[in-house]
Interface confidence: low
């Protein structure tokens, strides 16, 4: 039985040219995380964190994506095209797969506030 909950940074905003941390956290389960996949709104994979092999950043994002903190992902040099949904997929044993959603809005305004509260989707 899957008892866990994915908490995410929810809906966040950040300014163009800046950076943002995408963070998911798996709680309320003793399951062990074997792999975390990070996907963009068009379902293209940004990065993978494998328990054995460590981080793999996909070549198309190498210049703008940094691993961490933790199992999270840091997006840098944001553009307006980065606006949209991001998904974290946690592969765990023995529970199976958990999925979390984050919506990022990239703002032109220099006064854009970067909110990073944790939410349960």
């Amino acid at each position: 039985m899957m008892t866990g909950t994915i908490e995410t940074t929810g809906n966040i905003s950040a300014k163009k040219g800046g950076s943002v941390i995408l963070q998911c956290h798996l709680s309320s389960t003793m399951a062990q995380v074997t792999q975390v996949n990070w996907e963009q709104h068009d379902h293209s994979l940004l990065a993978i964190r494998n328990a054995e092999l460590g981080w793999h950043i996909y070549p198309a994002f190498k210049d703008r994506v940094a691993p961490g903190p933790g199992l999270g992902l840091t997006l840098q040099s944001l553009t307006m095209n980065d606006t949209g949904e991001y998904f974290c997929t946690y592969h765990t044993y023995p529970d199976g797969t958990y999925r979390g959603r984050i919506f990022l809005e990239v703002l032109e305004s220099s006064v854009a506030e970067h909110s990073a509260r944790f939410q349960i989707p």
């Epitope: 062990q32 074997t34 494998n50 054995e52 092999l53 460590g54 793999h56 023995p94």
Partner: antibody, heavy 125, light 106 residues
Framework: QVQLVQSGAEVKKPGASVKVSCKAS????????IAWVRQAPGQGLEWMGW????????NYAQKLQGRVTMTTDTSTSTAYMELRSLRSDDTAVYYC??????????????????WGQGTMVTVSS | DIQMTQSPSSLSASVGDRVTITCRAS??????LNWYQQKPGKAPKLLIY???SLQSGVPSRFSGSGSGTDFTLTISSLQPEDFATYYC????????FGGGTKVEIK
Amino acid sequence: QVQLVQSGAEVKKPGASVKVSCKASGYTFTSYAIAWVRQAPGQGLEWMGWISAYNGNTNYAQKLQGRVTMTTDTSTSTAYMELRSLRSDDTAVYYCARSGSSFWSGDVLGAFDIWGQGTMVTVSS
Amino acid sequence: DIQMTQSPSSLSASVGDRVTITCRASQSISSYLNWYQQKPGKAPKLLIYAASSLQSGVPSRFSGSGSGTDFTLTISSLQPEDFATYYCQQSVPPRTFGGGTKVEIK
């Protein structure tokens, strides 16, 4: 064909160190992890740890922490296992093995699908 | 760490016999269970991965089943080359092996 070839047998004195090599061929070395497993004479198999050939990420068995170091040389597709402060109970055959998990499986299955031939390490005064 | 208990530790059988080896995990490991065969003086060989998947090149007389905590390796009709020691291994970090089952000629 896919294979792992290990260095030859070693005889060491207590307190010394040993470094065993494991050369991979026939597959993309950096797409997998290399695990090390040892087997004392007449005993079962003991997992020692692994190293990612992709980025050097390591995970060691708790009982060996501080005494073991695993490294890779991607230019020669070779993995190394160094064990320090050797004791008589470290006498064993040491195997390297390819861990079948990869980034593309979407999961850690982690079966050891390819094994080296083994390296006998004898620790004796 | 997860403990793996294999039984029996040894067994005697004849060519053509159906042989069953069991492996029990101290906690649920889903299907993260592999089986290996080892002959004297040789490296282990992977037979079954993910509890029931047959490794390429392994004869179909070998099969695996189970999930959670209880697993079974079955050899449907024992052949002369099957006399060896068999190990289960759970592949949840940190890896642990069962104690082994030696299959001997009766």
